[in-house]
């Protein structure tokens, strides 16, 4: 090895002049942020104006007329998991604005990301959860009439965010904290290392799970309720049915860039440049992920005011008559054998 | 021709503190990161630590943070690392390393372009 | 920390023979900018450390062209070609994506 040449080599643009500054970045970009990170930022902090104010008055509205209204229920679970993700979105606004830093230690960077994934599998299984009450309403009213209540609304929501903390086990467990070394910073993310396949694994069950599968059967759930809506000529308000269609159809528009990106990363080698494109626009597919937890309480004013005319009452009665509908199956069994015979045609509208 | 001199040898007694030396020549001492690194005989190295000497802005191993500290002179050009509470443990050669300086991918502070022949430091009693 | 796992830990080999020693490590190294800071150190008896290879791949100024790196993520490897009797010594793989700065524990390539 001693016969190796040991000048001092040369670097290509190596300039001995240069000081060696601990905050401009080795790869030369700027200390300004990419536009996908300026747009998550934008997204990041409408969503938590409206996400944590909107939910907030949702829970408020439902939370009194959960004892006696099904759909009280319903709407309440999906606020409150909407509200629980945008608790986290201060903390993930301050990461993007510091170059994705992660300061906050190892135990918020396994949860807090993680709240939105929890959200996403908690929101499909609660909509899939209501999707299947509005069938049973409009196919089985009589079935609905025994055993239709708010008991085992309760367990069916409890059961979903079951799930949903099941199904987000995996990201949380493979969240860590890697400081780098230059520039120096502290990074949060998955690291699979050695296990690829279990990264895309993990990929495909979030895919499948958290959207193929509920896309599937939701559609066809909906497909039917509304050509049996549509075909019965309903005589009563489809107001549900149709706040419960925008919120599903929401989900599913504002997953897609998250899930695309995703499936893509797990299979693209980590340094290629289509990987280390899609990374760059990872904040902003999250962002757009999490117009979720803002979107469903617009949603209600939109059908709140649709269903008024204008915009006559305070919000909180024009929600409350959006989101505690009763359901012409009412809760009280004291109604006759041919009562619910009669009222079974009108159910068909919900 | 870059050169990073460090004295020989050095002895202490376990408790002591000592400090050693790595002078630089043949390059802008300022404008390159110094790093110190550990190795027992017939071991594997150890990373301690670097510092900038331009700022004075150094950054430890964990496992040295509290017995370790670097420092340089501008003026001599000279980098010092500074071991208190020696142990048998830390009888070993230390070296110093400079990295290069370059705006690019590949480059940057990431690797050592250039080690000190290293300092045996023997603690004995 | 990154733990760096060197095979093997001795390789025998006749000179002009290809050799080939492999790195590991516990975590992935790809940094942030998709660079792997992965690289290659020969260290001579008595001597200190030489850099071969920087950034997995790029031979350093005056390394000879039998010296190749090649690896991303976790696994890396070390190849030289015709083995001379001055590439005999201890080499060491070294990463320095993340901190701690870490070192392989070394394998010896020696003269069967």
């Known amino acids: 090895m001693d016969s190796f040449n040991y000048t001092t080599p040369d670097y290509g643009h190596y300039d001995d002049k240069d000081t060696l500054d601990l905050n401009t970045p080795v790869d030369k970009t700027s200390n300004t942020l990419r536009v996908p990170d300026i747009l998550a930022l934008v997204i990041f902090a409408v969503v938590f104006l409206v996400g944590v104010l909107g939910n907030a008055l949702v829970v408020w509205v439902t939370a009194f007329e959960a004892k006696r209204t099904i759909n009280a229920i319903w709407f309440l679970n999906l606020a409150v998991a909407d509200f629980l993700s945008c608790l986290a979105l201060p903390i993930l606004f301050t990461s993007i604005v510091q170059h994705h830093h992660w300061p906050f230690g190892g135990a918020a960077c396994s949860i807090l990301p993680s709240l939105i994934l929890l959200n996403m599998y908690a929101s499909i299984l609660l909509l899939a959860t209501i999707s299947a009450d509005r069938f049973l309403l409009v196919f089985k009213p009589i079935w609905c009439q025994n055993f239709r209540g708010a008991g085992l609304a309760w367990i069916a929501c409890a059961v979903a965010w079951g799930l949903a903390l099941l199904l987000t086990i995996p990201s949380f467990l493979y969240r860590v904290v890697r400081e780098e070394y230059f520039p120096p910073k502290v990074l949060c993310g998955v690291d699979y290392s050695h296990d690829k396949r279990r990264e895309r694994a993990v990929a495909i069950v979030r895919l499948v799970l958290g959207f193929l599968w509920p896309l599937l059967t939701l559609t066809i759930c909906y497909t039917f309720i509304l050509l049996r809506t549509w075909s019965r000529r309903a005589t009563r308000s489809t107001k549900t049915l149709k706040v419960v269609v925008a919120v599903v159809a929401s989900f599913f528009i504002f997953w897609l860039p998250y899930q695309v990106t995703g499936i893509m990363m797990s299979f693209l080698e980590p340094s290629s440049p289509t990987f280390l494109l899609l990374k760059k626009l990872d904040s902003l597919c999250v962002s757009f992920a999490y117009i979720n937890c803002c979107i469903n309480p617009i949603i209600y004013v939109v059908a709140g005011q649709g269903f008024q005319g204008r915009l006559r009452k305070s919000l909180p009665s024009l929600l409350r008559n959006v989101l505690t509908e009763e359901s012409v199956v009412r809760e009280s069994k004291s109604f006759t054998r041919s009562t619910v015979d009669t009222m079974a045609q009108k159910t068909q509208a919900v | 021709q870059v050169q990073l001199q460090q004295s020989r040898a050095a002895l202490a007694k376990p408790g002591a503190s000592v400090k050693l030396s790595c002078k630089a020549s043949g390059y802008t001492f300022t404008n390159h990161w110094m790093h110190w690194v550990k190795q027992r005989p017939g071991q594997g190295l150890e990373w301690i630590g670097y510092i900038n000497p331009i700022n004075g802005f150094n950054r430890y191993n964990q496992n040295f943070k509290d017995r370790a500290t670097l420092t340089t002179d501008k003026a001599s050009s000279t980098a010092f690392i500074h071991l208190n509470g020696l142990t048998y443990e830390d009888f070993a050669v230390y070296y110093c390393?400079?990295?290069?300086?370059?705006?690019?991918?590949?480059?940057?502070?990431?690797?050592?372009?250039?080690w000190g022949q290293g300092t045996i430091l023997t603690v004995s009693s | 920390d990154v733990v760096m796992t060197q095979s093997p830990l001795s390789l025998p080999v006749s000179l002009g023979d290809h050799a080939s020693i492999s790195c590991r490590s516990s975590q992935s190294l790809i940094h942030s900018n998709g660079n792997n800071y992965l690289h290659w150190y020969l260290q001579k008896p008595g001597q200190s450390p030489k850099l071969l290879i920087y950034?997995?791949?790029n031979r350093f100024s005056g390394v000879p062209d039998r010296f190749s790196g090649s690896g991303s993520g976790t696994d890396f490897t070390l190849k030289i070609s015709r083995v001379e009797a001055e590439d005999l010594g201890v080499y060491f793989c070294?990463?320095?994506?993340?901190?701690?700065?870490?070192f392989g524990s070394g394998t010896k390539l020696e003269v069967k």
């Open positions: 390393a400079r990295v290069p300086l370059s705006y690019g991918g590949s480059y940057g502070p990431y690797f050592f372009d250039f």
């Open positions: 070294s990463q320095s994506t993340l901190v701690p700065l870490t």
């Open positions: 950034t997995v791949s």
